[in-house]
């Protein structure tokens, strides 16, 4: 929970944040986990600690290892761990999987690619962007603040995008690169009035008191990427977040695209430790898009647990 993976390339800057968060006024001490040796705070060192941040300016392959951060309040010390790996620069263009940040998806209407980890650095615009190692040129590409915007996105725009920027520390400049994959969602399609596949209208769902129960709200909205489509649950006409019952939470399911190409969404309502009062609530599965809103209502009824004695006696 309080251990975090970080990675970078040799001869580039790498800044890592302590995964154990505290108040801004708390002090943070950093150590090499293997040796328990304190990491200096003096900025003249290549590797130094600066509050919640550990800075490698620049990083070396030998810096790889686990670093301990101890956040100290006036009365408590709490520990976090940063697992740092520094890799040699690749001679060829391919960026290996272990250097990739999370994949992002875009479409014609939303094509922002954020530069990973950039908020940790002292950088100035503009960012440089590369796709598959080629510098991006042309009016379709706009570097804006910490992200890249691609106009009129096409499926050919999918690929690995690298942002490159300069971190400045006390007048010295250090290069930083970060790469993530970009996928393009198919924009061709149509939109129609929501069709709720589950639950059925006025369905009665049997549940056992004291057990957990799941209700799935599943609806389809058309074909291809949908501009506005949502499924959600309401309790007695109130949003789950406003209802204020921590036992009852909704959790987005997978975006589904069935074999017929329909764009569908799931929302799972999880009820932990079902109570008698839950049987009195009205559960509404709502599906909405630009065409309108459709509602299916579900009620819970008590399922009598099987008496195993009567079966086996």
């Amino acid at each position: 929970k309080f251990s975090k993976q970080s990675w970078g390339l040799e001869n580039e800057a790498l800044i890592v944040r302590c995964p154990r968060q505290g108040k801004p006024s708390y002090t943070v001490d950093w150590y090499y986990s293997q040796t328990n040796k304190s990491i200096p705070t003096q900025e003249r060192n290549r590797v130094f600690a600066s509050g919640q941040l550990l800075k490698f300016l620049p990083a070396a392959v030998a810096d790889s290892g686990i670093y301990t951060c101890i956040v100290r309040s006036p009365t408590f010390n709490r520990t976090g761990y940063a697992n740092v790996t520094i890799y040699k620069k690749q001679s060829d263009c391919n960026v290996p999987d272990y250097l990739m940040y999370s994949t992002v998806s875009g479409s014609e209407k939303n094509s922002k690619i954020y530069c990973p980890t950039i908020d940790l650095y002292n950088w100035t615009a503009p960012l440089e962007w590369f796709k598959n190692c080629q510098a991006l040129q042309g009016s379709r590409y706009r570097a804006h603040k910490s992200f890249l915007v691609i106009d009129n996105v096409m499926t050919e725009d999918a690929g690995d995008y690298t942002c490159k920027f300069i971190h400045n520390e006390n007048g010295a400049n250090y290069s930083v690169t970060a790469t993530r994959s970009f996928t393009v969602k198919d924009e061709q399609g149509f939109s129609l009035f929501p069709v709720i596949g589950a639950p059925a209208q006025n369905e009665i769902k049997e549940v056992e008191i004291g057990k957990n129960a799941n209700l799935t709200c599943s609806a389809c909205f058309g074909k291809g990427t949908q501009f506005l489509a949502a499924v959600l649950w309401q309790l007695n006409g109130t949003k789950i977040t406003d209802f204020g019952e921590p036992r009852i939470q909704q959790e987005e399911g997978q975006n589904q695209s069935f074999s017929n190409g329909l764009a569908c969404l799931d929302m799972v309502l999880r009820i932990a430790d079902v109570k008698e009062e839950d049987l009195l609530l009205q559960y509404d599965c709502l599906a909405l898009n630009l065409h309108g809103l459709r509602r299916h209502t579900v009620r819970l009824s008590r399922k009598n647990p099987i008496d195993h004695h009567s079966i086996y006696c």
Epitope: F2, Q21, K23, S73, T75, F76, P246
Partner: antibody, heavy 123, light 107 residues
Framework: EVQLLESGGGLVQPGGSLRLSCAAS????????MIWVRQAPGKGLEWVST????????YYADSVKGRFTISRDNSKNTLYLQMNSLRAEDTAVYYC????????????????WGQGTLVTVSS | EIVLTQSPATLSLSPGERATLSCRAS??????LAWYQQKPGQAPRLLIY???NRATGIPARFSGSGSGTDFTLTISSLEPEDFAVYYC?????????FGQGTKVEIK
């Protein structure tokens, strides 16, 4: 020195209301999460409610949700627990306590506790 | 909610003996577990936080260990003032929950 002093307890009939107060001193009250914990006679500890620091969210135990309201007045360094629709099972010593770490969206231990105030719900 | 089960319910020991108290969580709480001591008529006192760290002013004879679902509070050599009720508490998520307590009494 950190001090927490509860008041407002007493005897109340079922269905009645009470408002507990907790006066805090010796620390910057506004930045800390504050908590109510209760203990029925001869029983264990039960968390009742938490209010996050700096005007943050509130959290309640199932057993009191919809009946109890936690609030704070940072200008008065005071924590409150408004208890409505009281039941016999709410009879307990009510402690206020401080969460000394209290970052957004997380919880921690209770490092300072008051001495408690007894609430008795009986007809 | 996360249920914490403490064992034994009562521990009868003599001063100078070693006390081992157990706390088991119904699901993982990582190291987000604390131990408290409560004496009759008093508020609880924090002993251990983050499963194994002693709170300020707590004697070294108190130690905590464990991670995930199984935790132990050890009192290496019982002093007369250690006879009390001990509670574990998880704080990984709301609702915060306590164990039912272990009473350490004089044999």
């Amino acid at each position: 020195e950190v001090q927490l002093l509860e008041s407002g307890g007493g005897l109340v009939q079922p269905g009645g209301s009470l408002r507990l107060s907790c006066a805090a001193s010796g620390f910057t009250f506004s930045i800390y999460d504050m908590i109510w914990v209760r203990q029925a006679p001869g029983k264990g500890l039960e968390w009742v409610s938490t209010i996050k620091g700096e005007g943050g969210g509130t959290y309640y135990a199932d057993s009191v949700k919809g009946r109890f309201t936690i609030s704070r007045d940072n200008s008065k360094n005071t924590l409150y627990l408004q208890m409505n629709s009281l039941r016999a099972e709410d009879t307990a010593v009510y402690y206020c306590a401080r969460d000394p770490w209290s970052t957004e969206g997380s919880f921690f231990v209770l490092d300072y506790w008051g001495q408690g105030t007894l609430v008795t719900v009986s007809s | 909610e996360i249920v914490l089960t403490q064992s034994p319910a009562t521990l009868s020991l003599s001063p100078g003996e070693r006390a081992t108290l157990s706390c088991r969580a119904s699901q993982s709480v990582d190291d987000d577990l604390a131990w408290y001591q409560q004496k009759p008529g008093q508020a609880p006192r924090l002993l251990i936080y983050d499963a194994s760290n002693r709170a300020t002013g707590i004697p070294a004879r108190f130690s905590g260990s464990g991670s995930g679902t199984d935790f132990t509070l050890t009192i290496s050599s019982l002093e007369p003032e250690d006879f009390a009720v001990y509670y574990c508490q998880q704080y990984i998520t709301a609702p915060l929950t306590f164990g039912q307590g272990t009473k350490v009494e004089i044999k």
